[in-house]
Interface confidence: medium
């Protein structure tokens, strides 16, 4: 999937962007609001009646190298007893980020975006039953 | 990929950190995207904590929309259908990467961007403070 | 996408145990909730269990329960079913089948299935 290019007349002036090869982007890595934090309510993931773990991912070779996904812990939803009903479903809640992937390739290195699909948390749904005739 | 040379030595030489400016293919690597719509749409309906989804636009951007939740309600639907206050409704938000254009409106530079996006809802057993 | 195999089917006596296997293909694997069914010769296919992505959450058919055991192992993308005193009556084409969703999978719509692999109960 290629990078959209908005109508040209939105442009600056070429001169006035920095050149760049055919078929490639220039990608400053530096990251503008890294510092950012998310400020969910405490706990959630245990508190919610669709719970879930989290596993982080390492790749040396993603930037960023890790990346957190969740996992419903149960395929019902916790009842106000406690209890695991079926009757409703625990399903995952994603979302895509991009990610910039380094290749070898013999004593070279190249680039490369990637989308990841990022499962967030989950949450608790009426199931879609079919009637099978 | 756009391939770049290393150093003479390069077996020697792996370099653990990813350099601060990269040249990367235009085309985006998107193996990993699975999502179904028509899977996972109806989630924001079908939840016992659902929410809207509002469309955010930005040029400057890729992706240029991205979708935000806002959760309908402060408690979570029962069992009737109801309202049920001793629960909450939160968001679940996610710190995502984007590209951001920069220097602005050139085609092919940009630069990596972190933001907060709330993706969906979830209920909650509420915090109850007892106050002495 | 997820690819489905199943293997470990086979010829058992009356009584006796098998393991069905079912490797998947896919990064995501720990991500779907995966399951087993069955289709007798004639009948329409039946719901043996399913298994939650971190493996905390099994359900089972209820008629099959005590009998069969269904765990999985994140690390090796692998799905197991060990089936215990079996009866001519469990002779089926077993297939392992995967979705993000146990609603659907619990009703037989899901998004991924194996091609199955056939058990065949006789003495």
């Known amino acids: 999937r290629k990078i959209p290019k908005v109508g040209h007349t939105f442009f600056q002036k070429p001169e006035s962007c920095p050149p760049v090869p055919g078929g490639s982007m220039k990608l400053d890595i530096g990251i503008i609001n890294e510092n950012q934090r998310v400020s969910m309510s405490r706990n959630i993931e245990s508190r919610s009646t669709s719970p879930w773990n989290y596993t982080v991912t390492w790749d040396p070779n993603r930037y960023p190298s890790e990346v957190v996904q969740a996992q419903c812990r149960n395929l019902g939803c916790i009842n106000a007893q406690g209890k695991e009903d079926i009757s409703m479903n625990s399903v995952p809640i994603q979302q895509e980020t991009l990610v910039v992937r380094r290749k070898h390739q013999g004593c070279s290195v190249s680039f490369q975006l990637e989308k990841v699909l990022v499962t967030v948390g989950c949450t608790c749904v009426t199931p879609v039953i079919h009637h099978v005739q | 990929g756009i391939t770049i040379p290393r150093n003479p030595g390069c077996p020697n030489s792996e370099d653990k950190n990813f350099p601060r400016t990269v040249m990367v293919n235009l085309n985006i690597h998107n193996r990993n995207t699975n999502t179904n719509p028509k899977r996972s749409s109806d989630y924001y309906n079908r939840s016992t904590s659902p929410w809207n989804l509002h469309r955010n636009e930005d040029p400057e951007r890729y992706p240029s929309v991205i979708w935000e939740a806002k959760c309908r309600h402060l408690g979570c639907i029962n069992a009737d259908g109801n309202v049920d206050y001793h629960m909450n409704s939160v968001p679940i938000q996610q710190e995502i990467l984007v590209l951001r254009r920069e220097p602005p409106h050139c085609p092919n530079s940009f630069r990596l961007e972190k933001i907060l996006v709330s993706v969906g809802c979830t209920c909650v057993t509420p915090i109850v403070h007892h106050v002495a | 996408d997820v690819q489905l195999v199943e293997s470990g089917g086979g010829l058992v006596q009356p009584g006796g145990s098998l393991r069905l296997s079912c490797a998947a293909s896919?990064?995501?694997?720990?991500?779907?909730?995966v399951g087993w069914f069955r289709q007798a010769p004639g009948k329409e296919r039946e719901f043996i269990g399913a298994?939650?992505?971190?493996?905390?959450?099994?359900y089972y058919a209820v008629s099959e329960k005590g009998r069969f055991t269904i765990s999985r192992d994140n690390s090796k993308n692998t799905l197991y079913l060990q089936m215990n005193s079996l009866r001519p009556e469990d002779t089926a084409v077993y297939y392992c089948?995967?979705?993000?969703?146990?609603?659907?999978?619990?009703?037989?719509?899901?998004?991924?299935w194996g091609q199955g692999t056939l058990v065949t109960v006789s003495s």
């Open positions: 089948t995967a979705d993000q969703e146990f609603g659907y999978l619990r009703f037989g719509r899901s998004e991924y």
């Open positions: 896919g990064r995501t694997f720990s991500s779907y909730v």
């Open positions: 298994i939650s992505g971190s493996g905390e959450s099994i």
